[in-house]
């Protein structure tokens, strides 16, 4: 019996329901009497949904998964996940035992977008060019782990004296906090990107220092 | 009639490999799933593994998961068991065994067995 | 994973009725059916009761299963010699636990 995932990752947002995808070919005269539909996590083992003997067993996960029972007799076995959360994350295995078996896993990638960053100087006054200033980057509430990007108005790389940390909330989503240390010249723009690798999404922040009054787009 | 023969067995050292063997006829082997089975001395019985039909899909038992692999040979009607890393708890009489013909109704036709004995 | 639970032991007389349970069947993780093994000395295990109550062609309906909550019965009436053996029940626990046995239990004929 084959049975038949995507072989790439369920992307998820937060928040929202993801839909994890799975099928077999039903042989003629098929009956859902004859169906054992299980999906487990490949890991833990745990117990998410099932399906024997022509009956829903329901959901054994936090009862947030659902089955698409008019669809289960034409051979589609996929798994309704709502209210996606991080810890929902990884690897779910789908079986399927008629009179033959087979099982195949599909992985879950949770993604969340992150804030647009806000951007603080200190000191914020009285800057003179050759002043050491520190620039944060503060972006909240994303997932996974941010990539933090710095570079000056012409586009150029600041690589250095750069310290980037994330912390995780109660719900395991990251704020992230760059800090760039840079001496300053006569005027000057500094950027931040931080980008969410799973979504391919930037966030950007920027601040332009022209002596005084500083700006902060 | 339905038959199946195991061979393969026999006095191993620890850590040592062996293959088994489960030679089926009188039935369309490549329609069923085929399981192994051990039992102990004295003990009760022990699922190993499961392969499907078409040998896509194999089960493990945790016990032996990552030093043993089931697979099959359709084209000669064969089931194997390749024990790697074996070790005393090993020693058992293993079994294999043909389904029914819906999976989860169990094991209908066994093989007499072949003696695996794991020690130094 | 579910233990399925089995008195290691059982005896009767020739002619009567005994009665093997087999507790633990609880699992919503695979088949709800249990099944059931006679395993005469010396030889390999037979199918005996197959989905709670069927019986594979060639067992005598001496033999019968029965389930009830979370236990499932091995009856044998009209007891005979031949009958001594250790049953084994089993049940089906989902993709990434395979099939579960009972500890067995070992039957005398007095």
């Known amino acids: 019996l084959e049975v038949q995932v995507p072989e790439d990752p369920v992307v998820a947002l937060v928040g929202t329901d993801a839909t994890l995808c799975c099928s077999f070919s039903p042989e003629p005269g098929f009956s859902l009497a004859q169906l054992n539909l299980i999906w487990q996590l490949t890991d833990t083992k745990q117990l998410v949904h099932s399906f024997a003997e022509g009956q829903d067993q329901g959901s054994a996960y936090a009862n947030r998964t659902a089955l698409f029972p008019d669809l289960l007799a034409q051979g589609n076995a996929s798994l309704r996940l709502q209210r996606v959360r991080v810890a929902d994350e990884g690897s779910f295995t789908c079986f399927v035992s008629i009179r033959d078996f087979g099982s195949a896993a599909v992985s879950l990638q949770v993604a969340a977008p992150y804030s647009k960053p806000s951007m603080t100087l200190e000191p914020n006054k009285d800057l003179r060019p050759g002043d050491t200033v520190t620039i944060t980057c503060s972006s909240y509430r994303g997932y996974p782990e941010a990539e933090v990007f710095w570079q000056d108005g012409q586009g150029v790389p600041l690589t250095g004296n750069v310290t980037t940390s994330q912390m995780a909330n109660e719900q395991g989503l990251f704020d992230v906090h760059s800090v760039l240390r840079v001496v300053l010249g006569a005027n000057g723009t500094y950027s931040c990107l931080v980008r969410n690798p799973v979504l391919q999404q930037d966030a950007h922040g920027s601040v332009t220092i022209t002596g005084q009054p500083m700006t902060f787009p | 009639e339905v038959q199946l023969l195991e061979s393969g067995g026999g006095l191993v050292q620890p850590g040592g490999s062996l293959r088994l063997s489960c030679a089926a006829s009188?039935?369309?082997?490549?329609?069923?799933?085929m399981t192994w089975v051990r039992q102990a001395p004295g003990k009760g019985l022990e699922w190993v593994a499961d392969i499907n039909s078409g040998g896509g899909t194999t089960l493990y038992a945790d016990a032996v998961k990552g030093r043993f692999t089931i697979s099959r040979d359709n084209s000669k009607n064969i089931v194997y068991l390749q024990m790697n890393s074996l070790r005393g708890e090993d020693t058992a009489v293993y079994y294999c065994a043909k389904h029914l013909d819906y999976y989860s109704y169990g094991m209908d036709v066994w093989g007499q067995g072949t003696t695996v004995t794991v020690s130094s | 994973q579910s233990v399925l639970t089995q008195p290691p032991s059982a005896s009767g007389t020739p002619g009567q009725r005994v009665t093997i349970s087999c507790s633990g069947v609880t699992s919503k993780i695979g088949s709800k059916y249990v099944h059931w093994y006679q395993q005469l000395p010396g030889t390999a295990p037979k199918l005996l009761i197959y989905r709670n109550f069927e019986r594979p062609s060639g067992v005598p309906d001496r033999f019968s299963g029965s389930t009830s909550g979370t236990s499932a019965s091995l009856a044998i009436s009209g007891l005979q010699s031949e009958d001594e053996a250790d049953y084994y029940c089993a049940t089906w626990e989902g993709a990434l636990n395979g099939w579960v046995f009972g500890g067995g239990t070992k039957l005398t004929v007095l």
């Open positions: 009188g039935f369309t082997f490549s329609s069923y799933p």
